[in-house]
Interface confidence: low
Amino acid sequence: YDFTNCDFEKIKAAYLSTISKDLITYMSGTKSTEFNNTVSCSNRPHCLTEIQSLTFNPTAGCASLAKEMFAMKTKAALAIWCPGYSETQINATQAMKKRRKRKVTTNKCLEQVSQLQGLWRRFNRPLLKQQ
């Protein structure tokens, strides 16, 4: 999906008002220094591409973030503020329904959500800061 046509300011507002809080809730009890941020993005469409990938694509050790509250709100924001996004996600959603809900927050999932927090922060300051 091409994220260049999204309403970035509306998505930013959704992140600041709810998504950020849900990410913090998910990470509660984890030290902010526990994970190193290895994923970055250089502008807002690029950030949304990476955010979508980490939020909705199952990875080894963390298969089902998509049913978390922050993920559902992310999906809603993208569906509302990115023209045509919903249509591209129909197949992905059908595949997701076949997966079982995660019962335990694994360390891999915590690491992945930590990466997501970094991507969302970069989305709000969209320039790749190479350390």
């Epitope: 260049t4 502008n43 807002r44 469409p45 690029h46 969209p126 320039l127 790749l128």
Partner: antibody
Amino acid sequence: QVQLQQPGAELVKPGASVKMSCKASGYTFTSYWMHWVKQRPGQGLEWIGVIDPSDTYTTYNQKFKGKATLTVDTSSSTAYMQLSSLTSEDSAVYYCTRSLDGFFDYWGQGTTLTVSS
Amino acid sequence: DIQMTQSPASLSASVGETVSITCRASENIYSYLAWYQQKQGKSPQLLVYFAKTLAAGVPSRFSGSGSGTQFSLKINSLQPEDFGNYYCQHHYDTPWTFGGGTKLEIK
């Protein structure tokens, strides 16, 4: 409306330094990145570097590291670029320009730097 | 660094004609390309960003297209105020680089 105000010209001697200014108005200064771009007479555009006014983070084009230093004064919404050890190669028009996603939507009028003895 | 190659370097056309300027990136920059117009003695003005999105206030006779490494700027029905220099610039990642420019002159 958004404005980036730059002095029209600077005349300096070879080997000296110059600090040029760019005063921003009409928007929240700390919400946008401030870039500097060089244009030699009859030539194209060269990106020098960028500063984030919210935290003063800077990144430079490798070619201008050691030559340009970017700073800001958030109290006056002003960005500065200092150029050191000036030579005739530094004679050019220097623009400040702002961005959010790496493209430049508003530009200053440019400061013409002349390096001459 | 990503190199941007613009062609042609100069172009002569008449009022009312349609012209195209092309820009090639040395590597994939997806849709992260901007176009600027610069008139003699003036600052550049943003025309197009994200390869195809027109900047505010830019007439609809301007249009951008392309993705990946090949891009173009098309100007339909040239007007006298359209003559000047045009530059492409990738905004994919630092360092940002510009094309060498295209000088559009009146025939």
